[in-house]
């Protein structure tokens, strides 16, 4: 028996369902009574889901996995993972045994989009050219950790005096705070771009300083 999986990682958004595809080619006359199917975590060998002795043995993984029972006889051994979370990320191995056995691993990459950045300014009034200001760009509840880029109004990257910190909640979703310290010109626009490296999703925020008032 030959097992086939997708070579590209499966990218799944947090709290959505993901399908880890695995298939085999059943011989003529194949019946489910002959099938032993095991899904396990590749690194730790922890059992995730199994089908043995002609029946679905159920989820061994937080009760969030399911097979496609009606499609098994056609050679579809895919695994459905429900309500994906950060800790599901990793490699899963699909073992299929009929008379002989084969296995293959599929990688799951988890992602969550970052929110549109909010911009704050300190100080936020009585600003004059030559003043040092602190601009903070904050974006929330994303995964994995973000990349943050600052640019001025002409699109020139601002790299000096930038401090970026990230903290995560109990689910592993990150909040990112990036602080730019800059000396004000006569007027100017400062943009922050928060990039999710897996989704290649960019979230933009900007602040324009033209004396008063401020524009966000």
């Amino acid at each position: 028996v030959e097992v086939q999986v997708s070579e590209d990682p499966v990218v799944a958004l947090v709290d959505t369902d993901a399908t880890l595809r695995c298939s085999f080619s059943p011989e003529p006359g194949f019946s489910l009574a002959q099938l032993n199917l095991i899904w396990q975590l590749t690194d730790t060998k922890q059992l995730v889901h199994s089908f043995t002795e002609g029946r679905d043995q159920g989820s061994a993984y937080s009760n969030r996995t399911a097979l496609f029972p009606d499609l098994l006889v056609q050679g579809n051994a895919s695994l459905r993972l429900q309500r994906v979370r950060v800790t599901d990320e990793g490699s899963y191995t699909c073992f299929v045994s009929i008379q002989d056995f084969d296995s293959a691993a599929v990688s799951l990459q988890v992602a969550a989009p970052y929110s549109k950045p909010s911009m704050t300014l300190e100080p936020n009034k009585d600003l004059r050219p030559g003043n040092m200001v602190t601009i903070t760009c904050s974006s929330y509840q994303g995964y994995p950790e973000a990349e943050v880029f600052w640019k001025d109004g002409q699109g020139v990257p601002l790299t000096g005096n930038v401090t970026t910190s990230q903290m995560a909640n109990e689910r592993g979703l990150f909040d990112v705070h990036s602080v730019l310290r800059v000396v004000l010109g006569a007027n100017g626009t400062y943009s922050c771009l928060v990039r999710n490296p897996v989704l290649q999703q960019d979230a933009h925020g900007s602040v324009t300083i033209t004396g008063q008032p401020l524009t966000f």
Partner: antibody, heavy 114, light 110 residues
């Protein structure tokens, strides 16, 4: 500076009610999950309740149906309404940022006694 | 009795390496992230390790966290007298749908 300041603790009789408040400053309160944790005298930590930034709520079994967590984002304040109080609710109550509490308040003491 | 089991006490001498365990199930530690807290005598707890193995800013690299299966561990190397405190593990529990703390471990530096 990120700060959390609890208030509202005190002495209350069994069956009584109390409302705890937690004033948050130094961060964008509305964007954060928040929670309450308590510690009975000489005992360990017990997570009491949590509220997501979107206001979905979660409770420990021990307080379900008696305690209500809520938030007022316009006031940057987290609340814990405690009803039908029992002697075993006597504890120091801490509020914290996130469910995994990366920032803690200093705590407020609740004593339930007749 | 806590769903997350920690030894009530642990001890070590200055400079030693000490490990504190936290045992759970597939519904909590097995499929969720683990967090560790330090509570010095008479003070509020503080976050020591988050996301199983990450240190918040300001926490010395003498403290490290790990997880295997349904158990997690906090390791403290180069033990110092100021490490004497109570240590708690915590994680989400899928069956209870709530966040949980372990019972705590009192660490004594001899």
């Amino acid at each position: 500076e990120v700060q959390l300041l609890e208030s509202g603790g005190g002495l209350v009789q069994p069956g009584g009610s109390l409302r705890l408040s937690c004033a948050a400053s130094g961060f964008s309160f509305s964007n954060y999950d928040m929670s309450w944790v308590r510690q009975a005298p000489g005992k360990g930590l017990e997570w009491v309740a949590g509220i997501r930034s979107g206001s979905r709520t979660y409770y420990a079994d021990s307080v379900k149906g008696r305690f209500t967590i809520s938030r007022d984002n316009s006031k940057n304040t987290l609340y814990l309404q405690m009803n039908s109080l029992r002697a075993e609710d006597t504890a120091t109550y801490y509020c914290g940022r996130y469910f995994n509490m990366d920032v803690w308040g200093q705590g407020t003491t609740v004593t339930v006694s007749s | 009795q806590s769903v997350l089991t920690q030894p009530p006490s642990a001890s070590g001498t200055p400079g030693q390496r000490v490990t504190i365990s936290c045992s759970g199930s597939t519904f909590n530690i097995g499929t969720n992230l683990v967090h560790w807290y330090q509570q010095l005598p008479g003070t509020a707890p503080k976050l020591l390790i988050y996301l199983t193995d990450r240190r918040p800013p300001g926490v010395p690299d003498r403290f490290s966290g790990s997880k295997s299966g349904t158990s997690a561990s906090l390791a403290i190397s180069g033990l110092q007298s100021e490490d004497e405190a109570n240590y708690y593990c915590a994680t989400w529990d899928d069956s209870l749908n709530s966040f949980l703390f372990g019972g705590g471990t009192k660490l004594t530096v001899l």
